[in-house]
Interface confidence: low
């Protein structure tokens, strides 16, 4: 792969071993403006696999608020507006990075943590298991 | 709100103002094990709004690899396996936190960044605009 030379203006790092502690500027550079998923789109209501959004709050985590999607139905909404159980509503999940305060309650010391969140739901054809 | 007392074992922080720099341990605590979205489920193929997953790589970002979903079709797959133009495949997007090397190429100095990623696709009823 390509080796990019280290910037001479980098801060010093005392510990070069893993696990390593790094400096992180919490002044977020935000490429987007909308943080409330309900305002960003109404897909959660218009989808054939609609979902509700639940607020998950944890003061020991950064960001402290995460929105979790929960599918409304086991099946999917058909053209008549009824639930079709030949299809399944399933959550689309994604692993995201969060910062966990460590030691607990510390304002300036964190550990990276990966968590799995449900972002929305999609309608899938079920896997039918045939018994021999 | 509840005020949680500061842990006396916290590292010292010189700058209490925002933007503030914090210490982050990069030894990730992972509550999940599967990081390849294609292995985690086959929803992207079984969905009525199927999508392809594209690998987005950036060595100046942590994590350096992010998977982006792109909807395969304008419409959704109907019961016949054909594309139904009365419905629309749309991407479900989520804001996630990543670490951006700052200054560039520094191994131990980062800035938090919010980016918008498409996680998967869902099938929605289109908004029909009626002309008066």
């Amino acid at each position: 792969g390509i080796t990019i030379p280290r910037n001479p203006g980098c801060p010093n790092s005392e510990d070069k071993n893993f696990p390593r502690t790094v400096m992180v500027n919490l002044n977020i550079h935000n490429r987007n403006t909308n943080t409330n998923p309900k305002r960003s789109s109404d897909y959660y209501n218009r989808s054939t696999s609609p979902w509700n959004l639940h607020r998950n709050e944890d003061p020991e985590r950064y960001p402290s608020v995460i929105w979790e999607a929960k599918c409304r139905h086991l099946g999917c909404i058909n053209a008549d507006g009824n639930v079709d159980y030949h299809m399944n509503s399933v959550p689309i999940q994604q692993e995201i990075l969060v910062l966990r305060r460590e030691p607990p309650h510390c304002p300036n010391s964190f550990r990276l943590e990966k968590i799995l969140v449900s972002v929305g739901c999609t309608c899938v054809t079920p896997i039918v298991h045939h018994v021999a | 709100g509840i005020t949680i007392p500061r842990n006396p074992g916290c590292p010292n922080s010189e700058d209490k103002n925002f933007p503030r720099t914090v210490m982050v341990n990069l030894n990730i605590h992972n509550r999940n094990t599967n990081t390849n979205p294609k292995r985690s489920s086959d929803y992207y193929n079984r969905s009525t709004s199927p999508w392809n997953l594209h690998r987005n790589e950036d060595p100046e970002r942590y994590p350096s690899v992010i998977w982006e979903a792109k909807c395969r079709h304008l419409g959704c797959i109907n019961a016949d396996g054909n594309v139904d133009y009365h419905m629309n495949s749309v991407p479900i997007q989520q804001e996630i936190l990543v670490l951006r090397r700052e200054p560039p190429h520094c191994p131990n100095s980062f800035r938090l960044e919010k980016i918008l990623v498409s996680v998967g696709c869902t099938c929605v009823t289109p908004i029909v605009h009626h002309v008066a």
Epitope: - | K70, R72, H73, V83, S118, V124
Partner: antibody, heavy 118, light 110 residues
């Protein structure tokens, strides 16, 4: 080899009607969505309409909605475009295309000319 | 509805490289695939790039496509230009409710 052959074009007066056909061969016709795309003389391409493989779902550009009807006969491997209330601005070469919207195949016919003039 | 804007014309000499841009007026270009079509005079369009950067079989590797999310634009690059590349080139994309073509770019190989 995929082949698409349009027919039915010609000269028609404003307010008149015309029916275009597209005979398809070289692929399983019923498995593919089909589209009509037009090109006015000396102008660019404009998407007109599309239909799902089964024929159950249709989709139209705003400029033709309510005037044009897309349909297909899978037993005859033929795509149709019924054009009513024709206007001078509908004058164009009309192309039939397979699976155009996603561009994975993007096969096009050679086109048929429709002229709306008094 | 959104628009796709292309330069009206570009020209370059044989053997050189030319790039044609396609800018989306609203909505993220990155969310939906971009296609590129070549149309020679008197002929029907043929697809040269689909899904942003994929080449159909039979299209030379001199043709390549790319996306720049920061400028909300797509590009078609043709390297080692040949006289037979002289044609009109159209970009195409879509949104949840419409399919749109760019206005086309006339490529002249000098």
């Amino acid at each position: 080899e995929v082949q698409l052959l349009e027919s039915g074009g010609g000269l028609v007066q404003p307010g008149g009607s015309l029916r275009l056909s597209c005979a398809a061969s070289g692929f399983t016709f019923s498995s593919y969505a089909m589209s009509w795309v037009r090109q006015a003389p000396g102008k660019g391409l404009e998407w007109v309409s599309a239909i799902s493989g089964s024929g159950g779902s249709t989709y139209y550009a705003d400029s033709v909605k309510g005037r044009f009807t897309i349909s297909r006969d899978n037993s005859k491997n033929t795509l149709y475009l019924q054009m009513n209330s024709l206007r001078a601005e509908d004058t164009a070469v009309y192309y039939c295309a397979r699976d155009l919207i996603w561009g994975v195949a993007g096969s096009w016919g050679q086109g048929t000319m429709v002229t709306v003039s008094s | 509805n959104f628009m796709l804007t292309q330069p009206h014309s570009v020209s370059e000499s044989p053997g050189k490289t030319v790039t044609i841009s396609c800018t989306r007026s609203s909505g993220s270009l990155a969310n939906y695939y971009v296609q590129w079509y070549q149309q020679r005079p008197g002929s029907a369009p043929t697809i040269v790039i689909f899904a942003n950067n994929q080449r159909p079989s039979g299209v030379p590797d001199r043709f390549s496509g790319s996306i720049d999310s920061s400028s909300n634009s797509a590009s078609l690059t043709i390297s080692r230009l040949k006289t037979e590349d002289e044609a009109d080139y159209y970009c195409q994309s879509y949104s949840p409710t419409s399919v749109v073509f760019g206005g086309g770019t006339k490529l002249t190989v000098l």
